[in-house]
C-alpha cells in the first residue's frame, strides 16, 4: 500500500476535479476488490507504481481508490437530440495526480500520473451488476472490461452476446 | 423519438396466466435492460425486475420471483413479461421502463410505457 | 432490500408556496436518488436523478438535493400543474426501491 492516509490526501477541494470544464457528479473514496474478495493494491516500486489483485491478512488496511462520476454522451445515441444515449464514466485515482489508465495496445491496466483534462484512457463506462457489484468499460475501447488476470488487473474483451457478469470482470466497492 | 408501447388492458380469472408486452423504438434495442414495475391501485411503485436485451439475462426482485417470468423478442425490440397464478393481489398498473444511463441503473427511470392494466376477477 | 422513507405521506398548500419533501435511505446511496411526479391516470415522470440533477425540460423551480441517507426535493412558486403525487427512487443498489410517494394537493 501507499503508506499515506488515502482520506487526508483526499480532503482537497473534490480533488481538484474538471475536465475539460466539467465537473464530476460525485466522488465517492472506496476501497476495490474483486468478485472473490481479493484486494486491489498499489505499491510503489522502482519510481513507478504497481498494481496487485491479493489477499490482504486479517486486519490489513485496505487501499482506497477515488472515483470521479462523469456523465457522457453515448455514442450510439440515435435521436441527436441529447436527451437519450448519456452514460456514466468513472475515473480511478489511489493518490493524489496518479490515474487507471488502460493500455489497449499492451491489454494491460497501469497507474499514470498526468495532468488534466485527463486522456480519454483514463475513463471507463461504469456498469452495475444485479450482484450489486460494478464493472469498468474502456471508453477508448468498447468491450473491453477491467478484469483480473494472474493476480494482475488487466484487460478482457467481453464478447457483446455474453453475460457481462463474467467474475473476473466483476468488482466490489465498499467505504470500510 | 424513444417509444415504449405496451399491450392493452387485460381482465383475467383467477389462477389464470397473462402475458402482456412492451415494444420498444427510437433507441438502439440492446443497449438499456427492460424494467417492469407494479403499482396497485393508489400505491406506490415496486420494481419486479428486468431483463438484458442482449443476452436474454434476468434479475427478479424476490418478491417476484414466482410471479413474473420476462423474456424478449429482439427481432421485434419487445420484451413479454407473463405472470402467472394470478390472484385479486395482482390487479394493477404494470408499466416497463428503460434506464437513464446506457449500463447503469443510478440514474433512475427515464422512459416510460403507459402501462398495461391487469384486472383480476372472477 | 434498501428502505427508502419518504415523509410527509400527503401535503396540503397554496399556490405560490414553497414546499419539501424527504427521502430517508436505509443506508448509504451516495447520490443515486432520483424523484418522479406521477399525475393521476398518467405514468410517472422523471424530475430529478443523481439527487440534484434537472431532467431535460423539468421547470427550474423543482430542486432536488442531498447525498448519503437524506435527500429532499423542493418545489418553489407551486403551480396548479404541480399537484400529482411525488416519489423518490434509490438506483445504487438491487431490487431497485421506491419511497411510498407524497400526495400533493391544494389548500
Known amino acids: 500500500a501507499f503508506g499515506i492516509s488515502g482520506v487526508q490526501k483526499y480532503t482537497r477541494a473534490l480533488h481538484d476535479s474538471s475536465i475539460t470544464g466539467i465537473s464530476p457528479i460525485t466522488e465517492y473514496l472506496a476501497s476495490l476488490s474483486t468478485y472473490n474478495d481479493q484486494s486491489i493494491t498499489f505499491a510503489l516500486e522502482d519510481e513507478s507504481y504497481e498494481i496487485y489483485v491479493e489477499d490482504l491478512k486479517k486486519d490489513e488496511k485496505k487501499d482506497k481508490v477515488l472515483l470521479s462520476y462523469y456523465e457522457s454522451q453515448h455514442p450510439s445515441n440515435e435521436s441527436g437530440d441529447g436527451v437519450d444515449g448519456k452514460m456514466l464514466m468513472v475515473t480511478l485515482s489511489p493518490t493524489k495526480d496518479f490515474w487507471l489508465h488502460a493500455n489497449n495496445k499492451e491489454h494491460s491496466v497501469e497507474l499514470h500520473k498526468c495532468e488534466k483534462p485527463l486522456p480519454d484512457q483514463a475513463f471507463f463506462v461504469l456498469h452495475n451488476m444485479h450482484s450489486n457489484c460494478v464493472s469498468f468499460e474502456c471508453k477508448t475501447d468498447p468491450g473491453v472490461f477491467i478484469g483480473v488476470k494472474d493476480n494482475h488487473l488487466a484487460l478482457i474483451k467481453v464478447d457483446s452476446s455474453e453475460n457481462l457478469c463474467t467474475e473476473n470482470i466483476l468488482f466490489k466497492l465498499s467505504e470500510t | 423519438e424513444v417509444l415504449l408501447q405496451q399491450s392493452g388492458p387485460e381482465l383475467v380469472k383467477p389462477g389464470a396466466s397473462v402475458k402482456i408486452s412492451c415494444n420498444a423504438s427510437g433507441y438502439t434495442f440492446s443497449d438499456y435492460n427492460m424494467n417492469w414495475v407494479k403499482q396497485s391501485h393508489g400505491k406506490s411503485l415496486e420494481s419486479i425486475g428486468d431483463i438484458n436485451p442482449k443476452n436474454g439475462d434476468t434479475f427478479y426482485n424476490q418478491n417476484f420471483k414466482d410471479k413474473a417470468t420476462l423474456t424478449i423478442d429482439k427481432s421485434s425490440s419487445t420484451v413479454y413479461m407473463e405472470l402467472r397464478s394470478l390472484t385479486s393481489e395482482d390487479t394493477a398498473m404494470y408499466y416497463c421502463?428503460?434506464?437513464?444511463?446506457?449500463?447503469?441503473?443510478?440514474?433512475?427511470?427515464?422512459?416510460w410505457g403507459q402501462g398495461t392494466l391487469v384486472t383480476v376477477a372472477a | 432490500d434498501i428502505q427508502m422513507n419518504q415523509s410527509p405521506s400527503s401535503l396540503s398548500a397554496s399556490l405560490g408556496d414553497t414546499i419539501t419533501i424527504t427521502c430517508h435511505a436505509s443506508?448509504?446511496?451516495?447520490?443515486?436518488l432520483s424523484w418522479y411526479q406521477q399525475k393521476a391516470g398518467n405514468n410517472p415522470k422523471l424530475l430529478i436523478y443523481a439527487a440534484s440533477k434537472l431532467h431535460t425540460g423539468v421547470p427550474s423551480r423543482f430542486t432536488g438535493s442531498g447525498s448519503g441517507t437524506l435527500f429532499t426535493l423542493t418545489i418553489s412558486s407551486l403551480q396548479p400543474e404541480d399537484i400529482a403525487t411525488y416519489y423518490c427512487q434509490q438506483g445504487q443498489s438491487y431490487p431497485l426501491t421506491f419511497g411510498s410517494g407524497t400526495n400533493l394537493e391544494l389548500k
Open positions: 421502463a428503460r434506464h437513464y444511463y446506457y449500463g447503469s441503473s443510478y440514474g433512475g427511470f427515464v422512459y
Open positions: 443506508q448509504n446511496i451516495n447520490v443515486w
